[in-house]
């Protein structure tokens, strides 16, 4: 997971999310995305 500190003093956490393709379609394999989390 990556963590970025901004001038505001808050930290925003970015988290990699992985899904199986068969859960959202008909293909095999994994789908990797990036979620920008809430302010901590």
């Amino acid at each position: 997971d990556a963590e970025f500190r901004h001038d505001s003093g808050y930290e925003v956490h970015h988290q990699k999310l992985v899904f199986f393709a068969e859960d959202v379609g008909s293909n095999k394999g994994a789908i990797i995305g990036l979620m920008v989390g809430g302010v901590v």
Epitope: K16, L17, F19, F20, E22, D23, V24, G29
Partner: nanobody, 124 residues
């Protein structure tokens, strides 16, 4: 109520192998996405790997890729974690977990069914 029961843990020397099993009961096995997590002393529970509902797809954490293999047997309602080339840092309590279809496979909060855990100790 879905129940998960792990077995197969134990003490193994570095470089050795173990196979963990996770028996699933009380639910429709084919509808549950299965994953494995582990928790070492003083550390957070971390994702190890997951297998799709069909068993056609797997995904692993970088730390175990190429050494660990997950499989599932629909006839036995069981998921397996084959662990090879074990290292000291693989020592942990290993948990199998189940999640609904469509949820992210690599984060704890996707999983709403958990086993009790089985201890794996890698030591010479």
């Amino acid at each position: 109520e879905v129940q998960l029961v792990e077995s197969g843990g134990g003490l193994v020397q570095p470089g050795g192998s173990l196979r963990l099993s996770c028996a699933v009961s009380g639910g429709t096995f084919s509808s549950i996405g299965m994953g494995w997590f582990r928790q070492a002393p003083g550390k957070e529970r971390e994702f190890v790997g997951a297998i799709s509902r069909s068993g056609d797809s797997t995904y692993y954490a970088d730390s175990v890729k190429g050494r660990f293999t997950i499989s599932r047997d629909g006839a036995k309602n069981t998921v397996y974690l084959q662990m090879n080339s074990l290292k000291d840092e693989d020592t942990a309590v290993y948990y199998c977990a189940g999640r609904p279809a469509g949820t992210a496979i690599n984060i704890r909060r996707s999983y709403n069914y958990w086993g009790q855990g089985t201890q794996v100790t890698v030591s010479s």
